[in-house]
């Protein structure tokens, strides 16, 4: 999916209002220095591309992020503010249903969410730079 035509301001508002709080809740008990951020993003479409991939693509070490509250809100936000996004996400919905079975928060999932927080923060910064 090409995120170029999204309403970035609306996505930022949704992130600041709800998604960020859910991410921070998920990370509760860990310090921001506990994990080393190894990925970043260049501009707003790039940030959303990587956020979408990291949130919904299961990885061998962390297969269950898609069922989390922040992931559901991310999906809803992208569907709302990115034209045509929801039509591209049928496979992602199947992945979420499969992932719903396990509820263990592993250290690797915490690390992945730490990376997500970094990508979201970069998204906000690139937005500020453009204004």
């Amino acid at each position: 999916y090409d995120f170029t035509n999204c309403d970035f301001q609306k996505i930022e508002a949704d992130y600041l209002r709800t998604i960020s709080k859910d991410l921070i809740t998920y990370m509760s008990g860990t310090k921001s220095t506990d994990f080393n951020n190894t990925v970043s993003c260049s501009n707003r479409p790039h940030c959303l591309t990587e956020i979408q991939s990291l949130t919904f693509n299961p990885t061998p070490r962390c297969a269950s992020l898609a069922k989390e509250m922040f992931a559901r809100k991310t999906k809803a936000t992208l569907a709302l503010w990115c034209p045509g996004y929801s039509e591209t996400q049928i496979n992602a919905t199947q992945a979420m249903k499969k992932a719903r079975k396990s509820k263990v928060t592993t250290n690797k999932c915490l690390e992945q969410v730490s990376q997500l927080l970094g990508l979201w923060r970069r998204f906000i910064r690139t937005l500020l730079k453009k204004q």
Epitope: N36, N37, T38, V39, S40, C41, S42, N43, P45, H46, T49, E50, S53, L54, N57, T59, P60, R61, Q112, Q115, K129
Partner: antibody, heavy 117, light 108 residues
Framework: QVQLQESGPGLVKPSETLSLTCAVS?????????WSWIRQPPGKGLEWIGY???????SYNPSLKSRVTISRDTSKNQFSLKLSSVTAADTAVYYC??????????WGQGTLVTVSS | EIVMTQSPATLSLSPGERATLSCRAS??????LAWYQQKPGQAPRLLIY???SRATGIPARFSGSGSGTDFTLTISSLEPEDFAVYYC??????????FGQGTKVEIK
């Protein structure tokens, strides 16, 4: 200390597919970062080809997108480049590199690929 | 596509002298700029990222500055091992990351 090592044929015929592999040691490619390919024609500058991230997202240079495939094999801790329909203009030293999806902090030593019949 | 233009193409200096290399972007890249050093027969090495942050293990004599379209790499006092080709790279315009054509720093 992460180390990257490119391997593959040094000579490819025009119209065929160039295939290279980058073996990574000292770091798991499924643990973090992105894993990228960059090339440098003899005596010329650098050109970014694309990357695959540790979680599987893939991004390509638009000028090469129609001909490029980057994939990975996490069990072997390596990633690969395929470039189809090559011409003499694809003759270059091909580098693999570790990236944070923005810039490139560790590089392989490079491998020269010549396209010639 | 953002075009990166480096100047001069060649810089002839003696060890101990100060080197000032320029990189100009065809449109603003904010501070999304990196500098690399490449010696003959070797891979490039990351020197500077985010326009002014030194990469791990890079000596303090290397410094970067600039924002927007104009950037500078300064080597305060050239060491014999600093004679090489230097490239700038913008990473503001995903998915079209581009490099400059390089500046060769040679011994005078």
């Amino acid at each position: 200390q992460v180390q990257l090592q490119e391997s593959g044929p040094g000579l490819v015929k025009p119209s065929e597919t160039l295939s290279l592999t980058c073996a990574v040691s000292g770091y798991s490619i499924s643990s973090g970062y992105g894993w990228s390919w960059i090339r440098q024609p003899p005596g010329k500058g650098l050109e970014w080809i694309g990357y695959i991230s540790y979680y599987g997202s893939i991004s390509y240079n638009p000028s090469l997108k129609s001909r490029v495939t980057i994939s990975r094999d996490t069990s072997k801790n390596q990633f690969s480049l395929k470039l189809s329909s090559v011409t003499a203009a694809d003759t270059a030293v091909y580098y693999c590199a570790r990236t944070n999806l923005l810039y490139f902090d560790s590089w392989g030593q490079g491998t020269l690929v010549t396209v010639s019949s | 596509e953002i075009v990166m233009t480096q100047s001069p193409a060649t810089l002839s200096l003696s060890p101990g002298e100060r080197a000032t290399l320029s990189c100009r972007a065809s449109q603003s890249v904010s501070n999304n700029l990196a500098w690399y050093q490449q010696k003959p027969g070797q891979a490039p090495r990351l020197l500077i990222y985010d326009a002014s942050s030194r990469a791990t293990g890079i000596p303090a004599r290397f410094s970067g500055s600039g924002s927007g379209t104009d950037f500078t790499l300064t080597i305060s006092s050239l060491e014999p091992e600093d004679f090489a080709v230097y490239y700038c790279q913008q990473y503001s315009d995903w998915p079209q990351y581009t490099f400059g054509q390089g500046t060769k720093v040679e011994i005078k």
